[in-house]
């Protein structure tokens, strides 16, 4: 029950996280103009990964996709790539985890297969979350660097006088959405990996036996030892009771002297 809950919760948390990563990637407010110490408030500018927007003091806003013959900054392209990789991995992880859910029955899928799928989706969620966090952090780092460069430039002019007001840009809402979403996806992935341990069958009995309709005689399997999956070791080589079954070693296909008593 706890395993199913952990797996289900991991799935839901990851689902929310991936939805957040998609939302952050599509949002326009990755960098927003810092209005502090800026006397010109006629136009407010903010940028996303895909579009640049300007908002008038009247509230009128216009956005256009990046259109440049000189090419976009390499770092922006890198952030785009990280976010897209995060979304793709997350989406595949979600697809895999749906089939891995313990509460969903698909044909005669074994628990070991579900455990493997749960682990796979968990790893995918972890990598997806890390990609999103990395992408957002790289972008944030660029903004911090630019912010302090702009601040330094603001106060370096002829004889210490301010010549032109340099616009500074600060963190947009998308960065916070991205960080939280990446974190949730990461947590969801960890939960799926934990659930995988509980899903894996503890013990499997491997018996190579042939059954015969022979009286009421009871035989014990001479070497029937428990096979371990790796999650629980079988230190005591316990015998396994086999009802009326005989192992291949015990089956005698030729007549013996006891048959004619």
């Amino acid at each position: 029950m706890a395993v199913t809950a952990c797996q289900g919760l991991g799935f839901v948390v990851s689902l929310i996280g991936i939805a957040g990563i998609i939302a952050a990637t599509c949002m326009d407010q990755w960098s927003t103009q810092d209005l502090y110490n800026n006397p010109v408030t006629a136009v407010f500018n903010y940028q996303g990964l895909w579009r640049s927007c300007v908002r008038e003091s009247s509230g009128f806003t216009e956005c256009r996709g990046y259109f440049t013959l000189l090419g976009l900054p390499a770092m922006l392209q890198a952030v785009r790539a990280l976010m897209i990789v995060g979304i793709v991995l997350g989406a595949i992880g979600l697809l895999v985890s749906i089939f891995a859910l313990k509460c969903i029955r698909i044909g005669s899928m074994e628990d070991s297969a579900k455990a493997n799928m749960t682990l796979t989706s968990g790893i995918m969620f972890i990598v997806s979350g890390l990609c999103a966090i990395a992408g957002v952090s790289v972008f944030a780092n660029m903004l911090v660097t630019n912010f302090w460069m702009s601040t330094a430039n603001m106060y370096t002019g002829m004889g210490g006088m301010v010549q032109t007001v340099q616009t500074r840009y600060t963190f947009g809402a998308a960065l916070f959405v991205g960080w939280v979403a990446g974190g949730l996806t990461l947590i969801g992935g960890v939960m799926m990996c934990i659930a995988c341990r509980g899903l894996a069958p503890e013990e499997t009995n491997y018996k190579a036996v042939s059954y015969h309709a022979s009286g009421h005689s009871v035989a014990y399997k001479p070497g029937g030892f428990k096979a371990s999956t790796g999650f629980g070791s079988n230190t005591k080589n316990k015998k396994i009771y086999d009802g009326g079954a005989r192992t291949e070693d015990e089956v005698q296909s030729y007549p013996s002297k006891h048959d004619y008593v």
């Epitope: 500018n45 300007v54 900054p73 770092m75």
Partner: nanobody
Amino acid sequence: QVKLEESGGGLVQAGGSLTLSCAASRSIFSIDVMAWYRQAPGKQRELVARIWADGSTTYADSMKGRFAISRDTAKNTVYLQMNSLKPEDTAVYYCNAVGTIADGAFRPYNNWGQGTQVTVSS
């Protein structure tokens, strides 16, 4: 950063025409949007017209039909053709550029020129 320099302002009779120009210090291909704003004494700075990198334009309602924004990519210059000028068009006209410096990192900017005075006498 992108430095902007306006020119073409001056005194003009009502009903007359004037062309303002704004020269950018870097290729305007790297600029997302260039715009003209104006500020009359005691009033807030308002949008006149803007031209985006893809060539699309936007005009303030009161200037539609009278004003036209254009650009010359070879000269890295944006123009504002003003026709049928009225005394209420008297203001300081500012050039604005918004974009990203593509030097590897993501360095956005929103820069203004010093402004050029346009006076329309009746």
